[in-house]
Interface confidence: medium
């Protein structure tokens, strides 16, 4: 009977883990919908309002390959970075490739030297993975160095030629990105 | 043109208090929201509070809660900083700055609309 009762508790209690794993991934899931549907809709904003511009890129905005970045020149908490670039139809930059980074540290250096700038990168409270703001994880060479000892929830940043990490609510700098309108000629 | 002076720094002992004021000209001030920020020296400049003219909303950054209190008097053109229960690593240059004229809110301050700074010292 005892030995009944054990089988049963222990059924239970995988049931709940089951239950809390299924609940961590629609949350994820959840985020990532929210995080992809401010995404397609500030694609859609840039593909709109590029259909009036024939050039590139916006003005004071710089172009590499199929990219545009604008380089603030505001402070902002990570969050509403996010919200100024999702405004100008772009989102906060996501870094793909060392090539990338190299020039996103390049055109640093010539505009505005060794400050901070948030870019679209951060720390999953419940995992702590690093996640870019479309939910891909970034690439192994692109983690951001453990520099942050914050309780509070950690971003992402470039300073230099470096991907660093920091509480969110400090106030920094930011790069925005968005595709380049593809020429009709 | 945007102008901000601060004063009210100086050296304080731990548990000590500090009122340091912002001084705004240049600028209807009604259209701002006014920053309260700090850097220590080798470390990245952090914000401490904000006040919106807008809608009087505050913010505070999780460090200084409940110790520190900004406030503005629109007469004076001036945002004050109330420092309360000062500790040693509240030790900085602080400094104000102006928020962006198109977003009158505590969203993002521009690097050439802030102030020179006043030293905090907090030391026994």
């Known amino acids: 009977k005892l030995l009944q009762v054990s089988t049963i508790a222990m059924q239970q209690q995988e049931k709940l883990i089951q239950q809390e794993r299924a609940l961590l991934n629609f949350t994820e899931w959840k985020r990532s919908c929210a995080l992809q549907m401010k995404y397609c809709q500030a694609f859609m904003q840039n593909s709109l309002s590029s259909a009036h511009n024939s050039s590139p890129c916006p003005n004071n905005w710089i172009q590499n390959r199929e990219s545009c970045y604008y380089v603030s020149e505001i402070w902002s908490i990570w969050h509403t970075s996010q919200e100024n670039c999702l405004k100008e139809g772009s989102t906060l930059l996501q870094i793909e490739s060392k090539e990338e980074m190299d020039f996103i540290t390049g055109s640093l250096r010539k505009i505005k030297g060794s400050y901070d700038y948030w870019v679209g990168l951060s720390q999953d409270g419940h995992s702590g993975r690093w996640l870019w703001q479309d939910g891909s994880s970034p690439s192994p060479g692109l983690l951001p160095a453990e520099r942050s000892q914050s309780a509070n929830q950690v971003c992402g940043y470039v300073k230099s030629n470096s991907l660093l990490s920091s509480n969110c609510s400090t106030w920094k700098y930011f790069i925005c990105e968005k595709y380049a309108l593809r020429s009709s000629v | 043109q945007v102008q901000l002076q601060e004063s009210g720094g100086g050296l304080v002992q731990p548990g000590g208090s500090l009122r340091l004021s912002c001084a705004a000209s240049?600028?209807?001030?009604?259209?701002?929201?006014i920053g309260w920020f700090r850097q220590a020296p080798g470390k990245e400049h952090e914000g401490v509070s904000c006040?919106?003219?807008?809608?009087?909303?505050?913010y505070y950054d999780d460090s200084v809660k409940g110790r520190f209190t900004i406030s503005s008097d629109n007469a004076k053109n001036t945002v004050y900083l109330q420092m309360n229960s000062l500790k040693p690593e509240d030790t900085a240059v602080y400094y104000c700055a102006a928020e962006v004229p198109s977003t009158y809110s505590c969203s993002g301050f521009r690097e050439d609309y802030k102030g020179k700074g006043t030293q905090v010292t907090v030391s026994s």
């Open positions: 006040i919106s003219r807008s809608d009087g909303s505050t």
């Open positions: 240049g600028f209807t001030f009604d259209d701002y929201a």
